[in-house]
Interface confidence: low
């Protein structure tokens, strides 16, 4: 099956790479605008220049285009703990990230929150903290993993899923008691 092309994609495919078809005259191919600029006026005729203008402050285009407007620069989400890695330029959007010893948790494709990397107290680091993933901890004996923190088995309630992890310790205690009574 041939994938369905949108109208704009159909029109663009008629022209060679780096050009687009004139919206009012499909016999004319106009040169696309460079990144950092946008389309102000289509080219008046074959071989004539497209009127491209530079993006204004607070906007950008990251690739060659024939957009009528530049795209608005993203703003880093302070409420999500994001910090600005690099500011917006006419040809590149703002780059947001997290502070040192933090990782990104993506709530959705384009929205992430910064969280502190787990320190693995009462455990050891199985996998170190990465840009998009928290530290993976392995807990010491007598501790179980809850919300990626090592918690004492004394906090393990029967209703929670830690009972299997803490069971060896419980059995050892019972064994000691049993041996003391024989």
């Amino acid at each position: 099956l041939v994938p369905h092309l949108g109208d704009r994609e159909k029109r663009d495919s008629v022209c060679p790479q780096g050009k687009y078809i004139h919206p009012q005259n499909n016999s004319i191919c106009c040169t696309k605008c460079h990144k950092g600029t946008y389309l102000y006026n289509d080219c008046p005729g074959p071989g004539q220049d497209t009127d491209c203008r530079e993006c204004e402050s607070g906007s950008f285009t990251a690739s060659e285009n024939h957009l009528r407007h530049c795209l608005s620069c993203s703003k880093c989400r302070k409420e999500m703990g994001q910090v600005e890695i690099s500011s917006c330029t006419v040809d590149r959007d703002t780059v947001c990230g997290c502070r040192k010893n933090q990782y990104r948790h993506y709530w959705s494709e384009n929205l992430f929150q910064c969280f502190n990397c787990s320190l693995c107290l009462n455990g050891t680091v199985h996998l170190s903290c990465q840009e998009k993933q928290n530290t993976v901890c392995t807990c010491h004996a007598g501790f179980f993993l809850r919300e990626n923190e090592c918690v004492s088995c004394s906090n393990c309630k029967k209703s929670l899923e830690c009972t299997k992890l803490c069971l060896p310790q419980i059995e050892n205690v019972k064994g000691t008691e049993d041996s003391g009574t024989t």
Epitope: H105, Y106, W107, S108, F115, Q133, N134, L145, R146, E147, N148, S159, L160, E161
Partner: nanobody, 119 residues
């Protein structure tokens, strides 16, 4: 089958209160972090709050901090969001969602409940 059913939305005056509930079924509720996100008319999803599976850790967006309280009752498989001092900008569809233990998004979302704050 995993199901999340939100309720408690409605029309309220600025400064008023509402309590949202999310009844969960089809999975081990106590095993997962749960959260609330919202979508205002014509806007994208906004994270509101999240609570750890055991209820001992809570996170809030700055916009709702001090006004909203997230809680859960693991014996009833229910998540709550107590919303006080409501403002017009809190008007949105509120969704509850499931998250895994490492704060990574899970695939299930509810249908949402509409909260309208207007005088």
């Amino acid at each position: 089958e995993v199901q999340l059913l939100e309720s408690g939305g409605g029309l309220v005056q600025p400064g008023g209160s509402l309590r949202l509930s999310c009844a969960a079924s089809g999975f081990t509720f106590v095993k997962y972090s749960m959260g609330w996100v919202r979508q205002a008319p014509g806007k994208g999803l906004e994270w509101v709050s999240q609570i750890a599976n055991t209820g001992d850790r809570r996170y809030y967006a700055d916009a709702v901090k001090g006004r909203f309280t997230i809680s859960r009752d693991n014996s009833k498989n229910t998540l709550y969001l107590q919303m006080n001092s409501l403002r017009a900008e809190d008007t949105a569809v509120y969704y509850c969602a499931i998250y895994t233990g490492r704060w990574e998004p899970f695939v299930y979302w509810g249908q949402g409940t509409l909260v309208t704050v207007s005088s």
